[in-house]
């Protein structure tokens, strides 16, 4: 009789068996019989071994072998095998940003019969690779539960019967998509042609992203750094060298292992400054004894739009205003508390039209008419007066919130024109004629 | 899988005209921030031009600014780069890239455009 | 601009060696370094970006290193498959720029 036949091992063509008989009678000859579904076929040895070659991948093959001596037939003895599957071939990945489809091909006739098992294992981390084995036949697979924008690699294996698989997996590398930034803020900082970005790290990897600013014909791109999801950070990113009051489009997008993700979007104005101080004064011209007519052109409305101007007149020195002179009224200059003060205030949004950045506004206003705007009052001037007058535009104008009306300098963006020529006022007729 | 295949190459004479193509797909195009390289007869690479994904912002190099445009058609995930006022200093293999935070990731075959009289 | 110098012009590696190309920026380009392989007809492939990350499907025998301004490519046990043209590039700020490259044949 022949026992303990052993498969040796078993490749996709080739099988090496052994076995053990009773005794140790070296003129036996050992008969095989091979069969499969494809056929059966004929085979002797002297050897208490062989291998058996030209087998087709995944198939189950039954050994039949009877020992024989002097033409005597001992008891035969069986085992079944499969051969192992072909590996796979021409691995196909399709990705989105936590799942992966993946295809395959195995050209083996017995392929129908077979099923598949998929080990996928994060880069650099083998300890928690995740298995899936297909139903026969099929040869696609989803998995899911991936991290965005990273790294990953599949070995599919073939395996037939009770788990005899192909020497060799189908090995394929892949990225799942990264995830898109959810959304970011924009800020403005106070007094800079400047924006800063704010967002939450989207999740999974990333190598960084790509940043694009763009205003009319305008545009920029840079890369940002790279962030970590893990810690729920707010990162933060300040886009310089802007202009002031400008609407700009800005996109970002997530990239990883060479991958783009969609961008986010997002349109910021910048914020405002003082405007720029225009480069003449303005023209003041006598009216009567005790009034003038003072004209000035718009301020530039580069750094953000013009909200108001303010007249001021002083009998002093001409210096260079500062916004601490936007407290004193005409108040103050009857009492003596002042030589300069804010006669009229403009409030430029009441006109009701919008001032685009090259349109330049002419301004007429007679100082000296009793009116009064705000917290201010146009009061009659001195005859024999010497003044001078110089214009304040404002691209943001606050008021004292306990000095109800009267602006506080220090809270407004503010700058002023040079002061005037001087300017000096008749005798009141009355005196001369009295 | 990423697959770019460039076309329109050719011989054209100095001054003339000629229209490249890069069909995109295997990857969702309009994510993409997109280039242009070439590469002389037997020289090295050169970045030529180069298109954001977000706005379609344009990026040229010095020597072919305002004579070399580069395009994008979502819609059909193609690339184009129109090459007016052509130079001998233009032949060249032009090949078009995916562009992900400066590298030149994912490559077409390239086609040849040669600039002679 | 910012010039891209690579060194050497070319070098020859027997089997199994370990060979350097080294890469210098003429300014500060943080890590946004690739380095590509072209054989003789076929258009360039990219095997590290960002100065170190290996591209999918590129041997581990090759790696990256550096930042700021000097870089280097390494391949350990030089196979024959890894003979051809190697170019560093740096896509810190246009134009991006590329080196002269580096010739790599089989001793």
């Known amino acids: 009789a022949v026992f303990d036949i052993h498969v040796v091992y078993v490749t996709t063509t080739e099988m090496w068996l052994d076995w053990k008989s009773p005794d140790g009678a070296s003129e036996y000859v050992y008969h095989l019989v091979i069969e499969s579904k494809h056929g059966s076929n004929h085979t002797s040895t002297y050897d208490k071994a062989i291998t058996l070659q030209g087998l087709i991948p995944g198939t189950l093959y039954n050994i039949t072998i009877s020992p024989e001596v002097d033409h005597v037939w001992g008891d035969p003895n069986s085992t079944a095998q499969y051969t192992r599957p072909s590996n796979v071939s021409n691995i196909d990945v399709s990705t989105n940003t936590t799942a992966a489809t993946l295809s395959w091909q195995n050209f083996d006739d017995a392929s129908p019969t077979y099923s598949y098992c998929l080990l996928i294992e994060k880069a650099g981390n083998s300890s928690n690779a995740t298995q899936v084995v297909t139903d026969i036949g099929i040869t696609d697979a989803t998995v899911t539960e991936l991290i965005p924008g990273s790294s990953y690699t599949v070995e599919i294996f073939a395996q037939v019967g009770d788990g005899i698989k192909s020497l060799e997996p189908g090995r394929k590398s892949f990225c799942t998509d990264p995830a898109s930034m959810a959304s970011f803020d924009c800020e403005v900082v106070p007094k800079e042609p400047a924006l800063v970005l704010k967002w939450t790290c989207p999740p999974g990897a990333n190598a960084g992203f790509e940043l694009e600013v763009s205003s009319g014909a305008w545009n920029n791109a840079t890369h940002l750094e790279s962030c970590s999801s893990e810690n729920g950070t707010e990162y933060r990113t300040e886009v310089t060298y802007l202009n002031f009051s400008t609407s700009y489009n800005i996109s970002i997008t997530t990239v990883s292992c060479g991958k783009m993700a969609a961008p986010t979007r997002n349109t910021c104005t910048t914020g405002i400054t003082d405007p720029p101080p225009p480069d003449g004064s303005p023209n003041i011209t006598s009216v009567s004894h005790n009034s003038v007519k003072v004209k000035f052109s718009g301020f530039e409305a580069s750094h953000g739009p013009i909200k108001a101007y303010a007249v001021i007149l002083t009998t002093g020195e001409a210096g260079h205003p500062s916004a601490d002179v936007l407290k004193y009224t005409y108040e103050d200059f009857k009492k003596g508390a002042s030589d300069t003060y804010v006669t009229y205030l403009i409030r430029t949004e009441e006109k009701g039209r919008s001032q685009s950045l090259s349109e330049v506004l002419k301004y007429e206003i007679d100082v000296g008419n009793e009116s009064t705007t705000l917290g201010y009052y146009n009061g009659k001037l001195e005859p024999l007066g010497s003044y001078r007058a110089c214009v304040a535009g404002f691209t943001n104008i606050t008021f004292h919130p306990q000095n109800k009306g009267l602006i506080d300098g220090a809270e407004s963006y503010v700058s002023f024109s040079r002061y005037s020529d001087a300017v000096s006022l008749p005798q009141d007729p009355g005196v001369i004629c009295g | 899988e990423v697959k770019l295949v460039e076309s329109g190459g050719g011989l054209v004479q100095p001054g003339r005209s000629l229209k490249l193509s890069c069909a995109a797909s295997?990857?969702?195009?309009?994510?993409?921030?997109m280039a242009w390289v070439r590469q002389a007869p037997t020289k090295g690479l050169e970045w030529v031009a180069y298109?954001?994904?977000?706005?379609?912002?344009?990026y040229y190099r010095d020597s072919v600014k305002g004579r070399f445009t580069i395009s994008r058609d979502n819609a059909k995930s193609t690339l184009y780069l129109q090459m007016d006022s052509l130079r001998s200093e233009d032949t060249a293999t032009y090949y078009c890239?995916?562009?992900?935070?400066?590298?030149?990731?994912?490559w077409g075959q390239g086609t040849l455009v040669t600039v002679s009289s | 601009d910012i010039q891209m110098t690579q060194t050497p012009h070319s070098l020859s590696a027997s089997l199994g060696e370990t060979v350097s190309i080294e890469c210098l920026a003429s300014?500060?380009?943080?890590?946004?370094l690739a380095w590509y392989q072209q054989k003789p007809g076929k258009s360039p492939q990219l095997l590290i970006s960002?100065?170190?990350p290996l591209h999918d499907g590129v041997p581990s025998r090759f790696s990256g290193s550096g930042s700021g301004t000097q870089f280097s490519l390494k391949i350990r046990n030089m196979q024959p498959e890894d003979e051809g043209v190697y170019y560093c590039?740096?896509?810190?700020?246009?134009?991006?720029?590329f080196g002269a490259g580096t010739k790599l044949e089989l001793t």
């Open positions: 590039q740096q896509g810190y700020k246009f134009p991006y720029t």
């Open positions: 295997g990857f969702t195009f309009s994510n993409y921030y």
């Open positions: 960002y100065a170190n």
């Open positions: 298109i954001t994904n977000g706005f379609g912002s344009t």
């Open positions: 890239s995916t562009v992900p935070l400066g590298a030149f990731v994912s």
């Open positions: 300014e500060g380009i943080s890590n946004y």
